[in-house]
């Protein structure tokens, strides 16, 4: 439910159930993809390491008018402690490569599945 920014953290570790919800949403996107996702929009590639959730959100937030990823954008906000706005790149340390949203989602999904299997939820 909650909207809303702020920096007070209810705990730094996303539980497995919350991560599973995010993974399931990414799976839905990849499986239900017919036409090019988000009309083939390009986003910055990110390093799938520390600060990944905020970085992923900062990259995807710049895609507008794409209902297919709106739930993903919203879910990612629950894993990032600060407010993210379009054009903000504080967590995107490297901005030298752009990829299609579809590829970005696939890469993120593969990485999150790996983390889930390994029990790494932070």
């Amino acid at each position: 439910l909650t909207c809303l920014g702020g920096f007070a953290s209810p705990g730094p570790v996303p539980p497995s159930t919350a991560l599973r919800e995010l993974i399931e949403e990414l799976v839905n996107i990849t499986q239900n993809q017919k036409a090019p996702l988000c009309n083939g929009s390009m986003v910055w590639s990110i390093n799938l390491t520390a600060g990944m959730y905020c970085a992923a959100l900062e990259s995807l937030i710049n895609v507008s008018g794409c209902s297919a990823i709106e739930k993903t954008q919203r879910m990612l906000s629950g894993f990032c402690p600060h407010k993210v706005s379009a054009g903000q790149f504080s967590s995107l340390h490297v901005r030298d490569t752009k990829i299609e949203v579809a590829q970005f989602v696939k890469d993120l999904l593969l990485h999150l599945k790996k983390l889930f299997r390994e029990g790494q939820f932070n």
């Epitope: 439910l1 909207c3 209810p10 705990g11 629950g78």
Partner: antibody
Framework: EVQLLESGGGLVQPGGSLRLSCAAS????????MSWVRQAPGKGLEWVSA????????YYADSVKGRFTISRDNSKNTLYLQMNSLRAEDTAVYYC????????????????WGQGTTVTVSS | SYELTQPPSVSVSPGQTASITCSGD??????ACWFQQKPGQSPVLVIY???KRPSGIPERFSGSNSGDTATLTISGTQAMDEADYYC?????????FGTGTKVTVL
């Protein structure tokens, strides 16, 4: 379809206790934070308490801190609000709300609200 | 404690634009949400993340948030939009609701 059904409201005397329940269905209850929000007759919305879905942290409005206790039973998909030392100003409709996902649930937006249960504190 | 202030009432003619403001210290640094509540009904989320609309919310509802003010705009206001509107934000481990604005469609 996501549904929230509150129960347990009623008439109670000042100083008394009441426990509200909220039965949830249609979503993975344990993944989501949940909140209670109340609305006194003819007044605005007031957030009461929240229970995160990530590690069991609880949050309270100053007006109820030390008197109300939020809890949840993920095996029963149920959220609770134990209200003690009730006062006349606690009279309100109490809404159960599906909150956000993840450790920073408050960034998400309160999507789904129950129909509310009425609590009246009066002698 | 953190406070969000809204005008008590806003009047608008059908088809015209209604703007509701929500003021709070550095509100632009937080995500703002907006809720619509009609008499006898539960609140409904109409805007989250400052300007995003949940599915099912008409395009005439839009939002913005910067500085100390968040704004809900209803373009081409219809009679069915007559309701109370509340902004909301999170500050220091608590949710805060705005004081509420009654929108009347003349």
């Amino acid at each position: 379809e996501v549904q929230l059904l509150e129960s347990g409201g009623g008439l109670v005397q000042p100083g008394g206790s009441l426990r509200l329940s909220c039965a949830a269905s249609g979503f993975t209850f344990s993944s989501y934070a949940m909140s209670w929000v109340r609305q006194a007759p003819g007044k605005g919305l007031e957030w009461v308490s929240a229970f995160s879905g990530s590690g069991g942290s609880t949050y309270y409005a100053d007006s109820v801190k030390g008197r109300f206790t939020i809890s949840r039973d993920n095996s029963k998909n149920t959220l609770y609000l134990q209200m003690n030392s009730l006062r006349a100003e606690d009279t309100a409709v109490y809404y159960c709300v599906q909150d956000g996902l993840g450790p920073y649930f408050y960034n998400y937006g309160m999507d789904v609200w129950g129909q509310g249960t009425t609590v009246t504190v009066s002698s | 404690s953190y406070e969000l202030t809204q005008p008590p009432s806003v009047s608008v003619s059908p088809g015209q634009t209604a703007s509701i403001t929500c003021s709070g210290d550095k509100l632009g640094d937080k995500y703002a949400c907006w809720f619509q509540q009609k008499p006898g009904q539960s609140p409904v989320l109409v805007i989250y993340h400052d300007s995003k609309r949940p599915s099912g919310i008409p395009e005439r509802f839009s939002g913005s948030n910067s500085g100390d003010t968040a704004t809900l705009t209803i373009s081409g206001t219809q009679a069915m939009d007559e309701a109370d509107y509340y902004c909301q934000a999170w500050d220091s481990s608590t949710y805060v609701f705005g004081t509420g604005t009654k929108v009347t469609v003349l």
